[in-house]
């Protein structure tokens, strides 16, 4: 009598995640009587994948009708494959008994699963930073297999080199994740800049996946302040302007102080954008000189994006004759520096 053979013709099968995998198995003889079961892995820790007689295996179906007479084909199809399904599958013949006794195993078929990386997600710094400072961006992508993957960073189309990338886990796994950090030095012109994380993998049809982040979310451009006095009007009123230029984001509060007392507070809103993405704002204050005996100390105080206030102060000379007032006189800065200090 010829010895029963359990034939698994394929040593290995590779499928794409989401597809179905067919694992072939035939037996050379109908005797002895007894069931066939499919396992993943070998030894005592093996996992039962399919048993015709009992159990619920919603993703596993027999390729041919196992109930038909003289059936010797015990191939199975596993639907909706995920990376977690990777492993070596064994078709095992049992001899009928109480309990059934394992008789012979096939050589095993290794199932390899190729899976696409998830769309890269780029996250930036939690708090804004100013020009000349370095900020870090992180890019993450998950669930890919095999492990080989390339990740590149670009800022405005130019590849970044200050990059640290890790693929986890280091050892063999059903799927992998990549995490990369890029360090970017900010400039005042970066409001419209963009960083791109580009991931390439064998499963992608030639086109890398991209994740983006706008530097506008990461940058703060502090304002320049300039206070000027226009020529005195006939009604003894002086028009003083505070020009706040080249700032980002728009969140800005401007306060006028006369001799240290709050005169008016304004909030910036709906400002037109400069070409470089920054904003300008001009505020006017009319000072009635005839209402003052002494010189008036005016302060333009700007609070930008929750940062410490920047002041620009100067004095309106009350003693001077109106006709002698020069036009468009720039104020002296008696307050803090015109740029924020961090």
């Amino acid at each position: 009598e010829e010895e029963l053979q359990v034939i698994q013709p394929e040593k290995s099968v590779s499928v794409a995640a989401g597809d179905s995998a067919t694992l072939n198995c035939t037996v050379s003889s109908l005797i002895p009587v007894g069931p066939i079961q499919w396992f993943r892995g070998a030894g005592p820790g093996r996992e039962l994948i399919y048993n015709l007689k009992e159990g619920h295996f919603p993703r596993v179906t027999p390729v041919s009708d196992p109930t038909k007479r003289n059936n010797m084909d015990f191939s199975i199809r596993i639907s909706n494959i995920t990376p977690a399904d990777a492993g070596t599958y064994y078709c095992v013949k049992f001899r009928k008994g109480s309990p059934d006794v394992e008789l012979k195993s096939g050589a095993g078929t290794e199932l390899s699963v190729r899976a696409k990386p998830s769309a890269p997600v780029v996250s930036g710094p939690a708090v804004r930073a100013t020009a000349e400072h370095t900020v870090s961006f992180t890019c993450e992508s998950h669930g890919f297999s095999p492990r080989d993957i390339t990740l590149k960073w670009f800022k405005n189309g130019n590849e970044l080199s200050d990059v640290q990338t890790n693929v986890d886990p280091a050892g063999k796994s059903v799927s992998y994740s990549i995490r990369s950090t890029a360090r970017v030095v900010l400039t005042r012109r970066d409001v419209h800049s963009q960083v791109i994380c580009e991931v390439a993998h064998v499963t992608l049809q030639g086109d890398p996946l991209r994740g983006t982040a706008n530097l506008s979310e990461a940058i703060r451009v502090p304002p320049f302040l300039e206070v000027t006095q226009q020529s005195m009007r006939a009604d003894n009123q002086v028009n003083v302007t505070c020009q706040v230029t080249k700032f980002y984001p728009q969140r800005l509060q401007l306060t006028w102080l006369e001799n240290g007392n709050v005169s008016r507070t304004e909030m910036a809103s709906a400002l037109p954008e400069n070409k470089d993405g920054t904003y300008n704002w001009t505020s006017w204050l009319l000072v009635n000189v005839s209402a003052h005996r002494d010189d008036v100390k005016l302060t333009c105080q700007v609070e930008h994006d929750g940062q410490p206030a920047v002041n620009k102060s100067f004095s309106v000379k009350v003693s001077a004759h109106p006709k002698e007032q020069g036009s468009n006189t720039a104020a002296e800065n008696t307050g803090t520096n015109e740029r924020n200090i961090y």
Partner: antibody
Framework: QSVEESGGRLGQPGTPLTLSCTVS????????MGWFRQAPGKGLEYIGI?????SPYYASWVNGRFTISKTSTTMDLKMNSLRSEDTATYFC?????????????WGPGTLVTVSS | DIQMTQSPSSLSASVGDRVTITCRAS??????LAWYQQKPGKAPKLLIY???FLYSGVPSRFSGSGSGTDFTLTISSLQPEDFATYYC???????????FGQGTKVEIK
Amino acid sequence: QSVEESGGRLGQPGTPLTLSCTVSGFSLSSYVMGWFRQAPGKGLEYIGIISSSGSPYYASWVNGRFTISKTSTTMDLKMNSLRSEDTATYFCARVGPLGVDYFNIWGPGTLVTVSS
Amino acid sequence: DIQMTQSPSSLSASVGDRVTITCRASQSINSYLAWYQQKPGKAPKLLIYSASFLYSGVPSRFSGSGSGTDFTLTISSLQPEDFATYYCQSWHYISRSYTFGQGTKVEIK
């Protein structure tokens, strides 16, 4: 699923020539496609690929001599200025469904002969 | 660019023989290697992908092995229809470029 090349002919050195690859049974917007060539009695040589979205990538030796493009149903290889060493059978092929590391569907090839 | 060195460049064998063809990459290509069979005047046919996976419809007498830089195509029992030229082809996941070996012609002894 199949691919077929066309446009191969006798061409003069210095003249342009465009080869086409027509696909059936699948969409060019879903797969990477490649161009290859084989000089008489020689081995296979990779020319370039075009990605599913239409981005071309070339072998380092191409140096701007060839241009790969595609429409919804055909992929083209434009040879800007023929040289005698371009005499070869040109094949187009489609990458496999599992990834871009192998080509599982090949056309029969089209012969380009460059001679004055 | 990666170089693929295939050996031997030709071999003579008889029907039923076990035939082994090797391919060496100038740097690691992991398992991104395919084997093709080509007959005169015909297009290449895919036999093996990912170094060891048999393409559907290809007879099981063909097998592939190896990873990194050294790869092997084995025909366990040569059949009359197997007399052809065999090419290895690599894909490098960093440069995303393809390279072929120079081919191995299997002839009848």
